[in-house]
Interface confidence: medium
């Protein structure tokens, strides 16, 4: 296999393959519960687990929630796909001042160049408008009246917005926070950044730093302050906390400045398909006792299904893994990750990701 000669329905009578007339070759038939990653799979590795809608299969073969672009200042750049998250970006007229994984934690309106400045580079979803001094012989036919002002002393290479107090701020420099839609009309009336030294003559502070949160007394820890419902990840990026809004989820730990909210299945349910800091699918089942882990199994038996080829070893619940390895830990909980194809990251791949707390009760696999 593949075969180039047509066979109706079967390929040499092999039940694990079928003939695809469209591509005129024999293709591997994915076992039940697994879905093909291409039109004509050739081997078991061309089959993948199916995640719930609005989840994608991450690099560790875990079902992970796609980010949502539901905030007023965000729009969808790329949709949620089977193997990649939805990507959000700031809506037109705004740029991202504090990035988040696959999204933006804080969007600002593009600055309008002040008097004496003209647009060098228009603002994008990622970058603010870049201004440059107007040449003495600038044509009156300017794109914007604001860009036709007489040159003034002092130049700024980029009009960098700052989250300043509303009394001195224009809409062009105000962040739009979740749930608040600033009317474009208001933004168009307040077009020019204030001609003050704080906004024109010198660079502002990092928009990601909260001006309302001074350093703690006796501490130099002026950490980056993320938007509500975002946390600062290990790479220093503001990352959206997961949501526990699904009926079968409850909040285990809240969204903190440096850690995501974590969700777990509500009482009486356990996690059958893990998601980072959450659970993609909760099912009303118990799991192995606290002392047990699941034996590794052959690739052919991952997500053991109707037609899983009878290869490899049988996965059982045993006191210790067959290979003597201790169960892998994925913080914050000790976890029995038994997701399909999770062997890339953990030595105990079978089929329903669950975790055990120190009490032996099932808790969510935080991924």
């Amino acid at each position: 296999f593949p075969q180039d000669r047509p066979f109706e329905d079967t390929c040499h009578g092999n039940p694990s393959h079928y003939y695809d007339k469209a591509v005129r070759r024999c293709c591997y038939r994915c076992p039940m519960g697994l879905f093909p990653t291409q039109q004509c799979p050739q081997r078991p590795t061309d089959c993948r687990k199916q995640c719930e809608p609005d989840y994608y299969l991450d690099e560790a073969d875990r079902c992970t929630a796609c980010v949502t672009c539901s905030r007023d200042d965000l729009v969808e750049k790329t949709p949620c796909a089977w193997n990649s998250s939805r990507v959000c970006e700031c809506r037109p007229g705004m740029f991202c001042s504090t990035s988040a994984v696959n999204s933006c934690a804080r969007c600002f309106f593009h600055s309008v160049c002040p008097a004496g400045m003209i647009v060098k580079f228009p603002g994008t979803a990622q970058k603010n408008t870049v201004c440059e001094p107007a040449s003495p012989g600038v044509s009156p036919a300017c794109a914007s009246p604001e860009n036709c002002k007489e040159p003034s002393s002092g130049t700024i290479p980029q009009a960098k917005p700052t989250p300043v107090s509303p009394a001195t701020s224009s809409a062009s420099t105000m962040p739009v926070r979740g749930g608040t839609r600033l009317a474009q009309e208001a933004a168009s009336k307040l077009t020019r950044a204030p001609d003050s030294p704080s906004s024109v003559g010198r660079p502002s502070s990092d928009p990601g730093l909260s001006p309302t949160q001074p350093c703690p007394e006796g501490s130099g820890d002026c950490r980056k302050q993320c938007e509500p419902d975002y946390y600062l990840d290990e790479a220093g990026r503001c990352t959206a906390c997961v949501s526990c809004s699904r009926d079968d989820l409850v909040e285990k730990t809240p969204c903190a400045w440096n850690s995501s909210r974590t969700c777990e299945c509500r009482p009486g349910m356990i996690c059958a398909t893990s998601a980072t800091n959450s659970c993609a699918r909760c099912v009303p089942y118990p799991i192995c006792a606290a002392e047990t882990v699941t034996k590794p199994q052959d690739m052919a038996e991952k997500d053991t299904t109707f037609e899983a080829p009878p290869l490899g070893t049988q996965p059982d619940c045993n006191p210790t893994p067959e290979n003597g390895e201790a169960p892998a830990s994925t913080s914050p909980t000790q976890s029995l990750l038994v997701d399909s194809q999770a062997s890339k990251t953990l030595p105990i791949p079978t089929s329903a990701p669950v975790a055990l707390s120190s009490t032996g009760k099932p808790v969510l696999d935080a991924g």
Partner: antibody, heavy 117, light 108 residues
Framework: EVQLLESGGGLVQPGGSLRLSCAAS????????MSWVRQAPGKGLEWVSG???????YYADSVKGRFTISRDNSKNTLYLQMNSLRAEDTAVYYC???????????WGQGTLVTVSS | QSVLTQPPSASGTPGQRVTISCSGS????????VYWYQQLPGTAPKLLIY???QRPSGVPDRFSGSKSGTSASLAISGLRSEDEADYYC?????????FGGGTKLTVL
């Protein structure tokens, strides 16, 4: 709450056809594999057919070539088209959800198919 | 004739422990998980044991499953009258799914 409701059973003559339906609710239908399992009167359970990815279908040898399983994810419905029916196909046909290695975790109440002249 | 072999009947008195066996081959039980289903009279089957020895929520811990090689067994301890039912073992085989012939359990 997960619910599976079969319909379409009835009396049919040998050689005839019948189409069974299974209406699913309470879960994301398109994300699960589904199956038909039958039980002849006073007999044991027999797996008939399964469906995963839309064009990936699976059949017991006893029905291969005569039965066709299909699904309509937009209607959350599973189907079993039964042609060339035989007396030995007489059974209660159950629709069952299959989830990874949990097996058939939810079953419908079944619909009776009687093949008799 | 079923691919998996079960005794057609078993019986016990209330409080007793009863074991139902299921014998297969390397292509089904030997290389895959075993499941047990309970079918009470006049009702649809219900998942009783999955992944050889795991119980779904709601299934009493009186029910336990085990597997060794190409055989599996279901044990019911502290037998009750409501346990009177048909019990089926099941396993995968290459590209299909097989059931045992079923065991009728009678509570005397």
């Amino acid at each position: 709450e997960v619910q599976l409701l079969e319909s379409g059973g009835g009396l049919v003559q040998p050689g005839g056809s019948l189409r069974l339906s299974c209406a699913a609710s309470g879960f994301t239908f398109s994300s699960y594999s589904m199956s038909w399992v039958r039980q002849a009167p006073g007999k044991g359970l027999e797996w008939v057919s399964g469906i995963g990815y839309p064009y990936y279908t699976y059949y017991a040898d006893s029905v291969k070539g005569r039965f066709t399983i299909s699904r309509d994810n937009s209607k959350n419905t599973l189907y079993l088209q039964m042609n060339s029916l035989r007396a030995e196909d007489t059974a209660v046909y159950y629709c069952a959800r299959y989830y990874y290695d949990y097996g058939f975790d939810y079953w419908g109440q079944g619909t009776l198919v009687t093949v008799s002249s | 004739q079923s691919v998996l072999t079960q005794p057609p009947s078993a019986s016990g008195t209330p409080g007793q422990r009863v074991t139902i066996s299921c014998s297969g081959s390397s292509s089904n039980i030997g290389s895959n998980y075993v499941y047990w289903y309970q079918q009470l009279p006049g009702t649809a089957p219900k998942l009783l044991i999955y992944r050889n020895n795991q119980r779904p929520s709601g299934v009493p811990d009186r029910f336990s499953g085990s597997k060794s090689g190409t055989s599996a067994s279901l044990a019911i301890s502290g037998l009750r009258s409501e346990d009177e039912a048909d019990y089926y073992c099941a396993a995968y085989r290459s590209y299909d799914y097989v059931f045992g012939g079923g065991t009728k359990l009678t509570v005397l």
